[in-house]
């Protein structure tokens, strides 16, 4: 049964334009069983930062260990895959980068990164200098395993010199690879030393050498590929929001909701409220009531805006979110002062939420 | 490994109830909506409404608001479909999916006939 | 409602060809689709979701596409076993509807 009565039965209308909040995916860091895996937080001049996983907040344990900036996970099992994020609090603002954990018999990796220059790994040699071919970025070759999402680009780099300036081919497996080796082929930037894959597969798995060859010399570098299926999931909220707020009588206030959602979330806001004095209803559900919910005639659901608000307004007020596979929700306290106790504002507003992109 | 176990095929005469079961096991029950799919020969694949057995939110298809009540019970980790007021064109198959509508109980047929 | 149209009923294919179902939606549901499998008798098997992320198991000849109003599932290289009836859904917004269904068939 309905754990709540609804105060007022709020007709849906159509969704909100479906693109909103999707969200691409993040980094995917994938591990063994029994492997330890070390990730760090990719955000800069973090005074504080707090970590989560699947929206709820993670503390050190005997198989996690939060030192600074890095996560460790020691003797992962399959219940560490999830959703993880670290939250930089600054004294001005925060920041938060979301990263996914699979633990799988896969070999452990990060994402690809997508590299926009490259211009200058065209090295050009003087003509009476032969030399055979060498690597003139290695620091765009160490991450030699990539473990990549399903559907994702893929481009694996070897930047390269000699003289006279080498060519460079590409093999699968130790095998020639060829373009009809996969749907959609693949890309070739001679002038990036690339290798660029779009849209992966499964089959896509597996072992990309780079050959790099002149008349004085050959070298070569081998990359693995482990293509990560995703999974469907519920949504998965922030934590720590929406925060609790204060405000004066009259004052205005803000709760922000922030959503992770590959599907299509529905947003509502819900406050607990009276009905005849009494908080619950005959059956012994609390009385709610639908305040703001995601719907074409509302903006930004994710942010639930009060104005001039009055001592009825105190109490706790819930972000409850949900898409095709399930719900999520967090709540908030609003503490309204009279006037004379005012805090150190007149009006008590949180930032508008940064949208996941 | 994850299953959806639903119970056996009914025949029920019109204007009776019937109540059709789904039990699941191999995840966390709660944690998932449970969706009810009606499938007939002539309509094809229609969306009941789901249940979400962690506080019982249900969402009816408005076609189905007064013929379909999902409920749930979070300790036998089973939904269950009561079907009121039976009339022929209820006869179908009717199939439990879990949230993402990645794993589908075997379905159950019901047939309404005097 | 958001109505699923799925206009081939039919499609005659032999194995080995390339063959594309194809769906359109009757308003703007981004990329909320999803595609099932169904043979006779079973329940439908989820291929597809998001429109184009493949479920772990399902093979890699099936590929999901589309966004907006129009999706495509497309199979590479059609074996026996892919001989089934194949229905797309919207998962953007209450109530979940499905399309009526092509039934690839061998010619």
């Known amino acids: 049964r309905p754990s709540f009565s609804l105060v007022e039965d709020t007709t849906l209308e159509p969704e909100e334009p479906p693109t909103k909040y999707q969200i691409s995916q993040p980094e995917v860091y994938v591990a063994a069983p029994g492997e330890s895996l070390e990730v760090r937080c990719l955000l800069k001049d973090a005074a504080v930062i707090s970590w989560t996983k699947d929206g709820v907040h993670l503390g050190p344990n005997n198989r996690t260990v939060l030192i600074g900036e890095y996560l460790q996970i020691k003797g992962a099992t399959p219940r560490d895959s999830g959703l993880y994020a670290c939250t930089a609090s600054r004294t001005v603002d925060s920041e938060t980068w979301y990263f996914m954990v699979n633990v799988t018999d896969a070999i452990s990796s990060g994402d690809d990164e997508d590299d926009t220059d490259g211009a200058e790994d065209f090295v050009s040699e003087n003509s009476n200098n032969k030399r055979a071919p060498y690597w003139t970025n290695t620091e765009k070759m160490e991450k030699r395993l990539h473990a990549v999402p399903a559907a994702n680009t893929v481009k694996f780099r070897c930047p390269a010199g000699g003289n006279p300036m080498p060519t460079m081919r590409w093999l699968k497996n130790g095998k020639e690879f060829k373009q009809e080796h996969r749907i959609g082929g693949y890309k070739v930037r001679n002038q990036h030393w690339s290798l660029i894959m779009e849209s992966v597969v499964p089959s896509d798995k597996g072992n990309y050498t780079c050959v790099v060859e002149n008349e004085y010399g050959s070298i070569n570098h081998t990359y693995h590929l482990d293509v990560v299926e995703r999974s469907p999931h519920r949504p998965i909220l922030q934590a720590g929001l929406p925060a609790n707020a204060s405000t004066v009588v009259g004052g205005d206030v803000e709760f922000v909701c922030k959503v992770y959602s590959d599907a299509q979330p529905h947003i509502q806001w819900i406050k607990h409220v009276e009905k005849n004095g009494s908080k619950y209803g005959p059956d012994g559900l609390p009385y709610l009531k639908v305040l703001k919910h995601s719907g074409i005639n509302s903006s930004n659901a994710e942010v639930l805006a009060l104005f001039n608000v009055t001592e009825a307004d105190a109490g706790e007020y819930i972000c409850k979110v949900s898409n095709y596979i399930g719900q999520a929700n967090q709540s908030a306290w609003l503490t309204v002062l009279p006037k004379q106790q005012a805090p150190g504002r007149e009006k008590e507003i949180t930032a508008s939420p940064d949208y996941l992109e | 490994q994850l299953q959806l176990q639903q119970s056996g095929a009914e025949l029920v005469k019109p204007g009776a109830s019937v109540k059709m079961s789904c039990k699941a096991s191999g995840y966390t029950f709660a944690s998932y909506n449970l969706h009810w799919v009606k499938q007939t020969p002539g309509q094809g694949l229609e969306w009941i409404g789901l249940i979400y057995p962690e506080n019982g939110d249900t969402s009816y298809n408005q076609k189905f608001k007064d013929k379909a009540t999902l409920t749930a019970d979070k300790s036998s980790t089973t939904a269950y479909i009561q079907l009121s007021s039976l009339a022929s064109e209820d006869s179908a198959v009717y199939f439990c999916?879990?949230?993402?509508?990645?794993?589908w109980g075997q379905g159950t047929t019901l047939t309404v006939s005097s | 409602d958001i109505v699923m149209t799925q206009s081939q009923k039919f499609m005659s294919t032999s194995v080995g060809d390339r063959v594309s179902v194809t769906c359109k939606a009757s308003?703007?549901?981004?990329?909320?689709v999803a595609w099932y499998q169904q043979k006779p008798g079973q329940s439908p098997k989820a291929l597809i979701y998001?429109?184009?992320y493949r479920y772990s198991g399902v093979p890699d000849r099936f590929t999901g596409s589309g966004s907006g109003t129009d999706y495509t599932l497309t199979i590479s290289s059609v074996q026996a076993e892919d001989l089934a009836l194949y229905y797309c859904q919207q998962h953007y917004s209450t109530p979940y509807t499905f399309g009526g269904g092509t039934k690839l068939e061998l010619k």
């Open positions: 998001s429109a184009s």
């Open positions: 999916a879990r949230g993402g509508f990645d794993y």
């Open positions: 308003q703007n549901v981004g990329t909320n």
